[in-house]
């Protein structure tokens, strides 16, 4: 029997330092995990301790934190060097900052094979691009070879910006020649390493022949065995064991987000290749395990140029950014029609001709936004005066509701309305009308939604049946503020963009903003 | 060195049951599935059905659903197949064999269980 | 079901001689073919797996070939210990199935 150690990450997303528990920005650093300098120490403890290691990304390192907004890409390249990576899959925020986001900061640069069997390139950018990532990659590993094949989630056109030169196939589809050929140039042993989501993490092992060992990403999925260190809760045992359709017993794993954990599988392998058993948990990489000090203090080298970022005018704004809690938790508020705005403008992708957008709506708890911005100063708006209006380290993710589930978030919104409290939604592709003279639970007395499926925008009647997309703060998918109804009856949930990035590169782009109160949230009654 | 152990002839009568005994050795038995191979005399070889001892998962050909029931003990490493309702054409040589996923080959069979049905 | 079939059930060949025993399927099974000999005691033991991957301490004299739906052992330089019944088995698809046999004889 051969014996090999997978470690493994995925959706990083720009957590270069360590962070607080929550993957927020660390404040007591006793307290603090996770950071590719803690990452690196206990890489190297196993690698020192275990013969045949690999050390895997299951893709998402792009976005987060200003790391990202800054270096574009850059820092991924350079620590993931560092670490030695021995591969990555592609995920879908690696192609945020469009193709050539990709390939000058991390494909050219990258000492490690980055994959994707079931990207295809097309046009012009076919030659570009060849030979920067590949579909799969013949790793030797002590005596033996490894094969690894990649894949990428099929909706990243919806999700990010790859352009219209790269095609995204169907994972099985394209995973399963791959592999084949793998088979014949007689590699025994393959790992599927993607970005797909913990679904598709599954079905890639019921459904592709000769993958015997799943590594994935995108759904942040927490497995473990036994009781769990930290705050997360699994949603399976470590490895979690897929039968495949001709019978294989096959490991699927993930290892949560934000760098929070290693992933830590051990497989032994017989001669022909079975995997013969497969174990281990991922490992929280909590304060007990020292950052390393070279590593360490390189991140302090390249933090100077964040400090520095902070201060710069990102954009101006003529009006008074209102994002008081007087304002945001009781009406609308500019400073929520901006951030929504904002939202809807990321996620502007014309993939379709008979629609202007994929989506349309966006929903924000007015408690998440925490300060007003000043325009009495020259009008300049800075990350750091964002960092105030949204110090949470959010995203804004993107999800499928019913418009029964969005009903229900709209009566949440108002259902104790007066009492200052977070829950009461800031919106934009919506009007609300609100009658607070009804009892909780039936004061939303209309509710238009902004079609997607016409050449001219227009509002329409929400419908209870039809699905939606929405965009809005991971917060609220995850059921925060008490909309538990998004989390338990949401149909899909991508995760999206760095709150704070999504709202600055809005403003450079506008250059100068003035939002306006525009009649989105209405009272039928009352003096509002 | 890998090795099947199968249980010694048996001879039944019609509608009675017989419950055969397959002994591995030399390997990690919880890990690999142990298949299930009928030959009736002077004929091919077909396969019954598979048992995977790990987690007890078990397939059955169409033919042998009812007919075969497929168990394993793993702290003796040993499967077994029970074959119920007895006929005569259930009068055959029974092996089991090991399963390689890799290729879906059976790499190491057990010298066969001689099934003898008569009144 | 995918239906193996070995159409040669029986065949003579001298010792020293090249001999070729072929199977087909019903459907293309992506070269996953196994090939097993029976010894007239009972004995079955894994030729070749995958095609033309020879198991383990089976002697070079043995090889397969094929693809799609045909396929075939070769068995280079015949030796009297080579006297058997040989099977192929599909390992594409559930249920596995086995050719019906090819019984070699000495001439």
């Known amino acids: 029997a051969w014996e090999l150690t997978i470690l493994h990450t995925n959706d990083v997303h720009s957590r270069l330092e360590q962070t607080s528990e929550d993957s927020s920005k660390c404040v007591n650093a006793s307290r603090c995990m996770g950071g590719v300098a803690r990452l690196f120490t206990k890489v190297q403890q196993i690698r020192r301790a275990e013969p045949n290691v690999l050390l895997l990304d299951a893709g998402d390192q792009y976005q987060g934190t200003i790391w990202f907004t800054v270096y574009k890409g850059a820092e991924v390249a350079h620590f993931m060097n560092a670490l030695r990576y021995d591969a990555m899959a592609l995920g879908n925020h690696e192609f945020d900052n469009g193709v050539e986001g990709l390939i000058e900061p991390l494909l050219k640069e990258a000492k490690f094979p980055i994959l994707s069997a079931n990207i295809k390139a097309k046009g012009p950018l076919a030659s570009q691009i060849s030979g920067l990532y590949l579909p799969y990659k013949v790793l030797p590993v002590g005596d033996e070879v490894v094969g690894i094949v990649g894949y990428t989630s099929k909706e990243t056109p919806f999700l990010s910006n790859p352009g219209t030169n790269l095609v995204f196939e169907d994972e099985i589809t394209a995973l399963q020649p791959e592999v084949d050929k793998l088979k014949t140039l007689n590699v025994n042993k393959i790992i599927a390493l993607g970005h797909s989501g913990f679904e598709m993490d599954k079905l890639i092992a019921q459904k592709v022949r000769g993958v015997d060992v799943v590594v994935g990403g995108h759904s942040n999925t927490f497995l473990y065995t036994g009781n769990p260190p930290s705050k997360e809760v699994p949603a399976g045992k470590y490895p979690f064991i897929v039968t495949s359709d001709d019978g294989r017993k096959v490991p699927v794993v993930q290892a949560y987000a934000f760098g929070k954990y290693l992933g830590y599988l051990k497989i032994e392998f017989d001669e022909r290749g079975n995997v013969i058993s497969s174990h281990g948990n991922p490992i929280l990489l909590n304060s007990s395990i020292p950052e390393d000090p070279s590593i360490k203090a390189d991140i302090n080298k390249w933090r100077i140029k964040l400090d520095n970022y902070s201060t710069q005018e990102l954009g101006k704004t003529i009006v008074y950014l209102d994002g008081s809690s007087q304002s945001c938790r009781f009406r609308e508020c500019n400073m929520g029609n901006l951030i929504c705005d904002a939202m809807i403008n990321n996620n502007l992708r014309h993939t379709d001709e008979m629609f202007w957008n994929h989506v349309s709506m966006c929903i924000l708890n007015g408690g998440g936004i925490r300060s007003p911005i000043d325009e009495r100063n020259n009008g300049t708006i800075t990350w750091e005066n964002l960092a105030a209006v949204l110090p949470f380290g959010g995203t804004f993710d993107l999800v499928q509701l019913k418009g029964s589930t969005l009903k229900k978030a709209f009566e949440h919104s108002v259902h104790r309305y007066g009492q200052s409290t977070g829950e009461f939604l800031q919106v934009g592709g919506i009007h609300v009308v609100y009658d607070l003279s009804r009892k909780p639970g039936d004061r939303v007395v209309k509710l238009d939604v902004l079609c997607t499926k016409c050449r001219v925008p227009s509002y329409d009647p929400l419908k209870m049946d039809e699905v939606y997309k929405v965009i809005l703060p991971n917060f609220l998918a995850n059921g925060g503020d008490g909309f538990q109804m998004i989390k338990d009856e949401l149909l899909r949930h991508d995760s999206g963009d760095q709150d704070i990035n999504v709202v600055s590169t809005y403003i450079s782009k506008m250059k100068v903003i003035y939002p306006a109160v525009e009649g989105r949230i209405k009272f039928s009654t009352g003096s509002h | 060195q890998v090795h099947l152990q199968q249980s010694g002839a048996e001879l039944a009568r019609p509608g009675a049951s017989v419950k055969l005994s397959c002994k591995a050795s030399?390997?990690?038995?919880?890990?690999?599935?142990m298949e299930w191979v009928k030959q009736r005399p002077g004929q091919g070889l077909e396969w019954i059905g598979a048992?995977?001892?790990?987690?007890?998962?078990?397939r059955y050909t169409q033919e042998f659903k009812g007919k075969a029931t497929l168990t394993a003990d793993e702290s003796s490493s040993t499967a077994y197949m029970q074959l119920s309702s007895l006929a005569s054409e259930d009068s055959a040589v029974y092996y089991c064999?090991?399963?390689?996923?890799?290729?879906?080959?059976?790499?190491?069979w057990g010298a066969g269980t001689t099934v003898t049905v008569s009144s | 079901d995918i239906q193996m079939t070995q159409t040669t059930s029986s065949l003579s060949a001298s010792l020293g001689d090249r001999v070729t025993i072929s199977c087909r399927a019903s459907?293309?099974?992506?070269?996953?073919l196994n090939w097993y000999q029976q010894k007239p005691d009972g004995t079955v033991k894994l030729l070749i797996h995958?095609?033309?991957r020879l198991h383990s301490g089976v002697p070079s004299r043995f090889s397969g070939s094929g693809s799609g739906t045909d396929y075939s052992l070769t068995i280079s330089n015949l030796e009297q210990e080579d006297i058997a019944t040989y099977f192929c088995?599909?390992?594409?698809?559930?249920?596995?199935?086995f050719g019906g046999g090819t019984k070699l004889e000495i001439k």
């Open positions: 064999a090991r399963g390689n996923w890799d290729d879906w080959d059976f790499d190491v």
């Open positions: 995958y095609t033309s």
């Open positions: 030399g390997y990690s038995f919880i890990s690999y599935w």
């Open positions: 048992i995977y001892p790990g987690d007890g998962d078990t």
């Open positions: 088995q599909q390992g594409n698809t559930l249920p596995w199935t």
């Open positions: 459907q293309d099974i992506s070269n996953y």
